[in-house]
Structures are given as structure tokens and as C-alpha cells.
């Protein structure tokens, strides 16, 4: 009986034509959100004045339907057990699931001028700028709409420059007809235990912005894990929004709508700095910030977004060191809504339900030459938004669940 | 891609003064800023000073500040080094360039003109 469980397992989560894997594979039957929460400042002129606390108040949910497109360009390779894809990019606006619209206001920290004066530490080239920032009538923090803090607004201190640069600027431009990857990933037919497990990204199997093994592209990406999986595993996979990887631990027992699943989360510990995890001293890139990496729950993926200074962390700086949140006033980190959680069907290795969560941040530092800046006397990471990215199996594909899969094991 | 040729240097006596022009052909000249280098025989190429594109504003070596000036004229696709009080030690080959900020930022310019010979002697 097992045996011939195990064997039409390993044949259904083969990612090939004809199998339950690929059908929900190439275009997930999951409906996923994703929740923004904006930080609004509420008191910049103090913060620009006098370097005080940032005071922050989230404002959310602001939720849009995501990863509903297809896979494209879905190839087979049979000389080395592969299949190759693109993950389209698309984001749908969800008033009924938001508490306003997109073309609410926000305080938030200026992008262009924070990156700007963070890429550009020549003394002749801060003058410059503070003269186009001053020209511009820009300053410190700024007043934008969800719109365009997400997707791209102009940015009229860098229109002012007279030869062509990117002059739109956004936390996630561009998105909308973009797409993530190529991912080449293991099929599985060959060794089942390899199934959906990265082979390369972008056509590397480094990522080329880390030291290491700290630079390596691990495991799968998340939708699904390798069958039969085990409470005692460590559950490697890559995040390109995050631009690394990182791993989820057993936690605890779930029930999900009549099937037992395995709750694991990202832990702590993978959020540690070098002193307590010796195994993250490649992902401390810079001794200042960091405090001679001593900081944790930050992560600095400058070199992932060419150069801006941006900052990951899990939402209200969740596992973060005390100096990371003091500048900043206003956030409440709690585990159960700020954690990263994966529900995974051990028998399939399916991953029926996952929270991810992450906080953008972005880094301004005092400059001498760039008057908007001049009075700050420290560092400041600044929250921009957080988001929760979520998906549960449906109770339609939860029942076909229960009736093939966990139903004939019990 | 701005192509650039300097003129103007020659022998001087300490304390005396020299203008240095720079002759830029390209369409690009007047959207970047633009600067003046000098390299000493046996030492590396140093910065000396620079100007945007406007002229607005204008940022020189502390070795030179006070007694050179920089200026251009994007009408005529100029740019000038006026040195007043020199020294011994500003001889060297004088080299102008520009380039968009990046280039600044990093001291990477993609190609050097010929240069113009400033000896400074008695």
C-alpha cells in the first residue's frame, strides 16, 4: 500500500506535462495577495531640523492580487531534467480588500535624494546635487501617492539633470509587464528529491552579490519542496526579492481545512548577526551601518539594486537589534503578524498556505554638502512599508486534496 | 562622446599666470560637467578643478584654491583654467575632460585628450 502511495507520488510531482504538480505549477489555482501597510511620517520638518526619532504610523492594508499570470516561456530539457521559465510580474488593485485608494497621500522619506546622496559621495558631486535638490524645491522626506511609491512617479530633482538618466523612480518600478528570472529548475524525473529545486537563475548559479556560500542560490522557490518531507529538515529556498537565500525550521502541526500540514518559519537565527551566527558573516557587506556587524535583522541589499541604499528586515524590525529601531518611533513588531510562515503538505511537498512578510527600508545619511541633510547627526534606516504576501489552497482544490492525496494515506 | 583638445600652456616664471583652454566637439558638451587634471613626470594624474554644467558652481584641489579659476562658455563649447601665483610645483601636463557624474564619482573618464605642457621655472 505505502509503496504504491509513494510511487504515484513520486510520479504526480514530476514537473512534466500531464501531472497535478505542473498543472498547479505553471499558473498557481491559489488566489495570492499582497498587503502593503506605508509608514506616514508624521514629523519630518523636526527629523530634517533637529535629527530627531522618525515617528512613523503604518496606514493599511492596501492589497492587490499578484502572481496570477502564467509561467512563460516553459521549456523541457530531457538531456539534463530541467525546465526553464519566466515568472511574469502583474499586480491588480483590490479596493474592497484595502482601506483606501491608490491615490492616497503619503510622508514618506524622498527615494531619489536618500539613494542620490548614498551613491554619490564625491564632495564636487554632492554640491551638484544639493543644487538640483534645492532647484527642485525637493527635501528630505516628500508627499506621494500609493501609486506612486509602488509603481513610479518622475522625480523632478533628477529631471533636472541634463543628459539622460532614469528619472522615474519606485519601490517596485518597474513591475507591471516585467518578469522574474529565467529560473531553470530541476523537473524531478530523474531524482525525485530534486524536484523544483533551482539548477540556475538568470542563467548563474551564484547570485555574484554576496561572499561565499552566502552568494549561493538554494533549494526551491517555496511554492514547493522535494515530497515527503520531514519535521527534522531545514527547507532551503531563494527569495529574489529579497535577494538571497534563506531557510524555514519545523515549527508546528496544522490543520488546513482537513489536511495536516507542517508549519515552518523563518527563524530568528537567520536573521542574527555573525556574533550570534557565525554562518551570516557573508551577508554583514559594510562595518559602519552594521557597527562592525554587530547590528541583526537587517539586511543591506545595496548591491542587488544598483547601489540604492536598501535595507531588508521582517515588518516593524521583527529580530532586529534595539539601535536598528531606535531612531524610529511608532512600530510594534509581534511575531504572529510579522513572521514568515510556509503550511507545506509533507506527502507532496506542496506548499498549501505561506505568509511572507518583509519591510523595505531605505538609508539617509547626514551630508555636509546636501543642505536637506546637513542637520542630521546620524544614520537612520528608514521604514518605507511593509508587506504580507499571502496564499491558501481553496476549498475546492483542498477537497480533491483530501480525497487523492492525504485521504488514501489515512 | 566629446572629444577634447587643450591648448594654452608654455613656461612661465614663478608667481606668473597662465590661461588654459579646452575646445569640446560633441553635442553632448554643455550637459556635463567638465574639469581640469594635471599629471607631474613620475606621478600619478590628480584632480585640479571642475565645473558644472551651468558654471553655477565650481570645486577645486585645495592646492590650487584661491589662485586658479575655472570657467566655460557652452556657446562656444569652452572651457578655461585661469592660473594666477604659480609655482614650481603646478608644473605638469594639464589635461581637461568631462563626463557624466557617475565618471566623477568613480575617476573613471573613458578617453584623454593630448594635454598642454605648463613648466613653472626661474
Known amino acids: 500500500g505505502d509503496l504504491l502511495i509513494q510511487k504515484t507520488i513520486k510520479k504526480q510531482v514530476v514537473l512534466e506535462e500531464g501531472t497535478i504538480a505542473f498543472k498547479n505549477w505553471v499558473k498557481t489555482g491559489t488566489e495570492v495577495y499582497r498587503q502593503f501597510w506605508i509608514f506616514d511620517v508624521q514629523n519630518p520638518q523636526e527629523v530634517m531640523m533637529n535629527s530627531s526619532n522618525i515617528q512613523v504610523k503604518q496606514r493599511g492594508p492596501y492589497t492587490y492580487r499578484v502572481r496570477f499570470l502564467a509561467k512563460e516561456n516553459v521549456t523541457q530539457d530531457a538531456e539534463d531534467n530541467t525546465v526553464s521559465f519566466l515568472q511574469p510580474n502583474g499586480a491588480i488593485f483590490e479596493p474592497s480588500l484595502s482601506v483606501g485608494t491608490e491615490a492616497d497621500n503619503f510622508t514618506v522619506l524622498n527615494l531619489a535624494v536618500a539613494a542620490a546622496s548614498h551613491i554619490y559621495q564625491n564632495q564636487f558631486v554632492q554640491m551638484i546635487l544639493n543644487s538640483l535638490i534645492n532647484k527642485s524645491k525637493s527635501s528630505m522626506f516628500q508627499v506621494r501617492t500609493l501609486r506612486e511609491l509602488l509603481w513610479g512617479y518622475r522625480d523632478p530633482f533628477l529631471s533636472l539633470v541634463p543628459y539622460p538618466v532614469t528619472t522615474t523612480v519606485g519601490l517596485f518600478y518597474p513591475y507591471n509587464n516585467t518578469a522574474d528570472g529565467v529560473y531553470k529548475v530541476f523537473n524531478g524525473k530523474d531524482n525525485i528529491s530534486k524536484v523544483a529545486i533551482i539548477d540556475t537563475y538568470k542563467g548563474k548559479r551564484n547570485l555574484s552579490y554576496w561572499e561565499s556560500h552566502c552568494d549561493m542560490i538554494n533549494g526551491t522557490d517555496a511554492a514547493s519542496f522535494p515530497p515527503f518531507v520531514e519535521k527534522s529538515q531545514v527547507l532551503q529556498f531563494f527569495s529574489s526579492d529579497i535577494c538571497r537565500s534563506i531557510y524555514a525550521v519545523f515549527e508546528s502541526d496544522v490543520n488546513l481545512k482537513g489536511i495536516p500540514v507542517y508549519r515552518f518559519v523563518l527563524p530568528s537565527k537567520a536573521f542574527a548577526s555573525p556574533v550570534e551566527n557565525p554562518d551570516n558573516y557573508c551577508f554583514c557587506t559594510e562595518k559602519i551601518i552594521s557597527k562592525n556587524c554587530t547590528s541583526y535583522g537587517v539586511l543591506d541589499i545595496s548591491k542587488c539594486k544598483e547601489g540604492r541604499p536598501v535595507y531588508i528586515s521582517l515588518p516593524h524590525f521583527l529580530y532586529a537589534s534595539p539601535d536598528v529601531s531606535e531612531p524610529i518611533d511608532g512600530l510594534n513588531p509581534n511575531e504572529e503578524e510579522h513572521r514568515t510562515y510556509l503550511d507545506i503538505e509533507p506527502i507532496t511537498g506542496f506548499t498549501l498556505q505561506f505568509a511572507k512578510r518583509l519591510q523595505v527600508n531605505l538609508l539617509v545619511k547626514p551630508s555636509e554638502k546636501i543642505q536637506v541633510l546637513k542637520n542630521l547627526k546620524r544614520n537612520y534606516i528608514v521604514p518605507i512599508l511593509w508587506l504580507n504576501e499571502t496564499g491558501t489552497i481553496g476549498d475546492e482544490k483542498a477537497n480533491m486534496f483530501r480525497s487523492q492525496v492525504t485521504g488514501k494515506i489515512n | 562622446q566629446v572629444q577634447l583638445q587643450e591648448s594654452g600652456g608654455g613656461l612661465v616664471q614663478p608667481g606668473g599666470s597662465l590661461r588654459l583652454s579646452c575646445a569640446a566637439s560633441?553635442?553632448?558638451?554643455?550637459?556635463?560637467?567638465m574639469g581640469w587634471f594635471r599629471q607631474a613626470p613620475g606621478k600619478e594624474r590628480e584632480f585640479v578643478a571642475a565645473?558644472?554644467?551651468?558654471?553655477?558652481?565650481?570645486y577645486y584641489a585645495d592646492s590650487v584654491k584661491g589662485r586658479f579659476a575655472i570657467s566655460r562658455d557652452n556657446a562656444k563649447n569652452m572651457v578655461y583654467l585661469q592660473m594666477n601665483s604659480l609655482k614650481p610645483e603646478d608644473t605638469a601636463v594639464y589635461y581637461c575632460?568631462?563626463?557624466?557624474?557617475?565618471?566623477?564619482?568613480?575617476?573613471?573618464?573613458?578617453?584623454w585628450g593630448q594635454g598642454t605642457q605648463v613648466t613653472v621655472s626661474s
Open positions: 560633441g553635442r553632448t558638451f554643455s550637459s556635463y560637467p
Open positions: 565645473i558644472d554644467w551651468s558654471g553655477d558652481i565650481t
Open positions: 575632460n568631462a563626463g557624466p557624474l557617475d565618471s566623477w564619482e568613480r575617476n573613471d573618464f573613458p578617453s
